[in-house]
């Protein structure tokens, strides 16, 4: 149904081997990365926190489809991982490797 | 070609008759709005400011389509318009009504 | 610093099109916008038009179909063309910044309308 | 559509306190925030109230703005006059019509 298949985080697991980052990220092997999957039709939930401009676009997309596109779901909150990398031939230790996880959806 | 159809800013006019917002926003008539249209494909250019999420997420997909969807194009950035507006029925003007125009785009 | 120049003819015949150019320094017409206004010599002030910093123009009913606003942004100009000019069209036209008021004005062009 | 009423003129001394008014001709003259600017003579005008009692950095507090819904008009005040304060003040407001109305000006003599 169009609620099931409204904007939100979904499980996407990252291997660093299948991107080719395990040439540099020695720890994790991998992580839970999530994505934004799903619409965003008017009217926007309040808990995809709309920017005003996401609104108009949404409104005007249902209106008419061929004059604009619909607002989209994209990650609005990212939260660090922990990592052991190689920096420079050494292995370094980064507590916080900012903007790699979703914590929250949003349409924008 | 696939740069013609890349993550941009493009011309979105907005009536507010049309929309309906006419019926509290008394000037402008109307406000270009833009909106951000095109691809996120991997590699993400530089000037669509990816988050380290969107360019792990581009390139999942470009190794699997199937389990993540592309980096999604969207505002980065959103300027004020000035508006003259009902407010509680006395007519308000506003220098700075926020979020309103699309000044950047980026790849989220 | 901010400025805002009216240039334009000091005679129009009657019945002939008025056009004045506002050119703009020290601030953006995308950030700002700019207001229209006349003054009929010893008489008050009238509002003609803005052209709003979103693009979107606004007239005054007043002038009908005879006024068109338009802008270049990247000139910083803001254009001002009436048609089928009277001899009551004689006045000061001016253009004005409005940022959370009013704060800066062009110096005036004085436009006769005569034969 | 409204009208925005002041009077032509008012003559006034140098130190005393003169009060020019904007009369809103029909519905609430509370409805729209007023604004009052500043002409001298050959001049372009200069804002002195805005949003009804505001005033921009550069204009002396000698000049306050008020109204009053019992006579559904806007005021400005001038206190201790000067010489300089010699002009023509105009009142401005919003409508859904008219998008900008000004009255039709006042002449302040300072004698």
């Known amino acids: 149904n169009a609620k099931g298949n409204y904007c939100k985080r979904t499980p996407l697991y990252i291997d660093f081997k299948e991107i080719g980052w395990d040439s540099w990220i020695i720890a994790p092997p991998g992580y839970e990365a999530y994505e934004c999957r799903g619409v965003c039709n008017y009217p926007l939930a309040e808990h995809l926190t709309p920017t005003k401009h996401a609104i108009i676009q949404a409104l005007v997309h249902l209106k008419n489809s061929q004059k604009a596109s619909k607002a989209c779901c994209v990650p609005t909150k990212l939260e660090p991982i922990s990592i052991l990398y190689l920096d420079k031939g050494v292995v370094t230790y980064k507590f916080k490797y900012e903007g790699m996880a979703v914590s929250e959806c949003g349409c924008r | 070609n696939a740069k013609g159809n890349y993550c941009k800013r493009t011309p979105l006019y907005i009536d507010f008759k049309e929309i309906g917002w006419d019926s509290w926003i008394i000037a402008p008539p109307g406000y270009e709005a833009y909106e951000c249209r095109g691809v996120c494909n991997y590699p993400l250019a530089e000037h669509l400011t990816p988050t380290k999420h969107a360019i792990i997420q581009a390139l999942v997909h470009l190794k699997n389509s199937q389990k993540a969807s592309k980096a999604c194009c969207v505002p980065t950035k959103l300027e004020p318009i000035s508006i003259l507006y009902l407010d509680k029925g006395v007519v308000t003007y506003k220098f700075k009504y926020e979020g309103m125009a699309v000044s950047e785009c980026g790849c989220r | 610093q901010v400025q805002l120049q009216e240039s334009g003819p000091d005679l129009v015949q009657p019945s002939q099109t008025l056009d004045i150019t506002c050119t703009v320094s020290g601030f953006s017409l995308t950030t700002y916008n700019v207001h229209w206004v006349r003054q009929p010599p010893g008489k008050g002030l009238e509002w003609m038009g803005t052209m709003w910093n979103g693009g979107g123009i606004d007239y005054n009913s007043a002038f009908k179909d005879r006024l068109a606003i338009s802008r270049d942004t990247s000139k910083n100009e803001v254009f001002l063309k009436m048609d089928s000019l009277q001899t009551d069209d004689t006045a000061v036209y001016f253009c004005?910044?409005?940022?959370?008021?009013?704060?800066?004005w062009g110096q005036g062009i004085l436009v006769t309308v005569s034969s | 559509q409204f009208a925005l009423i002041q009077s032509d003129s008012m003559s006034t001394s140098a130190g005393s306190t003169v009060k020019l008014s904007c009369k809103r001709s029909t519905g609430n003259i509370g409805s729209s925030y007023v604004y009052w600017y500043q002409q001298h003579e050959g001049r372009s005008p200069t804002t002195m109230i805005y949003?009804?009692?505001?005033?921009p950095d550069g204009v002396p507090d000698r000049f306050s703005g008020s109204i009053d819904s019992s006579s559904n008009s806007a005021f400005l005040t001038i206190n201790d006059v000067q010489i300089e304060d010699e002009a023509v003040y105009f009142c401005?407001?919003?409508?859904?019509?008219?998008?900008?109305?000004f009255g039709g000006g006042t002449k302040l003599t300072v004698l």
């Open positions: 401005q407001s919003f409508s859904s019509g008219i998008k900008f109305i």
């Open positions: 004005a910044r409005l940022g959370y008021y009013v704060d800066y």
């Open positions: 949003d009804g009692d505001k005033r």
